[in-house]
Interface confidence: medium
């Protein structure tokens, strides 16, 4: 009798759907070749395939096997019109599994999934399941068509780890799950507001998100023109306001507030606010005569366009006299004054329409 081949080896590639059959050659000399058959077991619906190869070959491939179906693979030694008993084995080609599942567009209540749809006519779709990490029962399940490569899971809770699986579906079978874990975002605060704006302080308030277990809030602030110079404050989760101090006058700041849950930060709530102008300081008087004197002051730290100086007799209810000088000057001589009279002098720094608080002094002629 003809000796059958030996050491039958079956390998199905789930990505390509190709079954590779290999064997060790028959010991019978001068054989014609080998006949290889693949048949679904137990009368299952599916293609029966057959290949005949030359005697010098020890492998062959089959395409178009249905994933998830069990096949019986047999290899016979053929010599003229005779055949050996076969060497046989069974294999179930795996349903192809997603290899490139990734997360996109993560919010505090949704997670977007993206994958490349598999190129196989036997795939009828994908099943998406969501489990809160550490729990057993899926809280969510849905099915999508085989052409779909994007899905958004919604209605999730903030700051929670979710195990999300995508399973390839075929008629009567499914792949092993491709599972990734992702945490939904921490809920951000809302409604950022600025009040009590001073030259070097501002009060920042926000509406906390409805998370009763936040670790803290992180407040970061820096001058818009120097965003590398960031200061950071950690605020108790029970507070929703902070006063920023030691700021630069007349400077626009970018302020962000984030919620922190364990080691996870929310997306920042951002806003901009400019500090007020600081006043000129150090008012002083010189060159005092019967009808004039010179007023001196020290410039504020803020960038300014000029000054407005008003003066009037101390017990005078009429309109004060007003002078304007450019930012480059820090003195002015007031003339045509009344002898022996106490004058009130006020100086305001200006930056466009913006005004600093008053610097006030008194001097007699």
């Amino acid at each position: 009798p003809l000796s059958p081949p030996t050491n039958l080896h079956l390998e199905a590639n789930p990505d390509t759907g190709v079954l590779t059959v290999s064997w060790e050659r028959s010991t019978t000399p001068d054989i014609t070749g080998y006949r290889i058959t693949t048949t679904p077991t137990n009368g299952q619906q599916g293609n029966s395939l057959e290949e005949v190869v030359h005697a010098d070959q020890s492998s062959c491939t089959f395409d178009n096997l249905s994933p998830g179906l069990e096949y019986n693979v047999s290899v016979y030694t053929v010599k003229d019109d005779k055949e050996s008993v076969p060497i046989s084995d069974t294999i179930i080609p795996e349903v192809p599994q997603l290899t490139d599942l990734s997360f996109v567009d993560i919010t505090d209540s949704s997670i977007g999934l993206r994958w490349t749809p598999l190129n196989s006519s036997t795939i009828i779709g994908y099943r998406i399941t969501v489990v809160a990490a550490g729990e057993g029962i899926p809280i969510f399940e849905d099915f999508v068509d085989s052409s779909v490569g994007y899905y958004t899971v919604t209605g999730l809770e903030p700051g929670i780890d979710y195990d999300i699986s995508v399973i390839t579906l075929i008629n009567g079978g499914e792949s092993a799950p491709t599972t990734l874990t992702q945490q939904t975002a921490v809920p951000p605060p809302t409604d950022l507001r600025f009040t009590n704006i001073g030259p070097d302080t501002m009060r920042v308030t926000w509406a906390p998100p409805p998370s009763i277990d936040l670790t803290n809030f992180l407040v970061r602030y820096s001058p818009v023109k120097n965003e590398e110079d960031v200061a950071e404050l950690s605020i108790s989760p029970s507070d929703n306001a902070v006063v920023l101090t030691n700021l630069l006058p007349g400077t626009e700041y970018v302020v962000s507030v984030s919620s922190v849950y364990e080691q996870h930060e929310s997306t920042p709530l951002r806003g901009r606010q400019k500090t007020g102008l600081d006043s000129p300081t150090g008012i002083d008087f010189s060159d005092i005569t019967a009808n004039s004197f010179t007023v001196h002051w020290i410039a504020p730290r803020a960038t300014i366009t000029g000054y407005r100086i008003r003066h009037h007799p101390e017990h005078f209810s009429g309109r004060p006299r007003e002078d304007r000088v450019p930012h480059s000057r820090n003195s002015i001589t007031l003339t045509n004054l009344t002898p022996g009279t106490e004058y009130v002098v006020s100086i305001v720094a200006l930056n466009g329409r913006e005004e600093s608080p008053l610097l006030i002094g008194q001097q007699s002629t």
Epitope: T107, D108, S109, A132, G134, E135, I139, E157, P158, G159, I160, P187, P188, T190, P208, P209, P210, S211, I212, D213, L214, S238, Y261, E262
Partner: antibody, heavy 123, light 113 residues
Framework: EVQLVESGGGLVQPKGSLKISCAAS????????MNWVRQAPRKGLEWVAR??????????YYADSVKDRFTISRDDSQSMLYLQMNNLKTEDTAMYYC??????????????WGAGTTVTVSE | DIVMSQSPSSLAVSVGEKVTMSCKSS????????????LAWYQQRPGQSPKLLIY???TGESGVPDRFTGSGSGTDFTLTISSVKAEDLAVYYC?????????FGAGTKLELK
Amino acid sequence: EVQLVESGGGLVQPKGSLKISCAASGLTFNTYAMNWVRQAPRKGLEWVARIRSKSNNYATYYADSVKDRFTISRDDSQSMLYLQMNNLKTEDTAMYYCVKQGGNSLYWYFDVWGAGTTVTVSE
Amino acid sequence: DIVMSQSPSSLAVSVGEKVTMSCKSSQSLLYSSNQKNYLAWYQQRPGQSPKLLIYWASTGESGVPDRFTGSGSGTDFTLTISSVKAEDLAVYYCQQYYSYPLTFGAGTKLELK
């Protein structure tokens, strides 16, 4: 079926102490935050205390009315929840309910309640 | 603290009647980011412990008859019983879980006429 059974209530004098307990069954106790909620006679409900799970470092939270007097604790190996009440006041007289947190989230409501245990603070 | 106000404090009804009760919060319980309202409703029958009916203001707890519905958003919420049954005679409490401390309303008592 999830069950919470409270015990340990009784009559205690003002400034006295009492420890009440809650035995949990039918749930993976160690994964849930647990609470005590009380109800004074013919009054409404008042949340008292909460303890989170081991994975959240057993963090505790209290109502202002019981802070520094009451201590919530748990023994996951026995599926037990406790409330140690010290320096009791007459206004602490109430039915005390052991309550499980609902939902898998930072936000929660109370989805399983025990039958309660009565604490009476009186001379 | 968020203050929860319920009205009316009691309500006399006949079996089969439709009933609505109100719950108002001192600040909004709606979180703009996920459009959820952090409000729950409970039922407490005489001599029993409270039972969860509704959470997220309108989601019915499993096993709760569908004659109970929750509605509303922001600061104004309503619990409706479409056709009252004898076993619905109880006190109904609303509760906010937006922030600490968790607070309940004083309750609405449903009684038979």
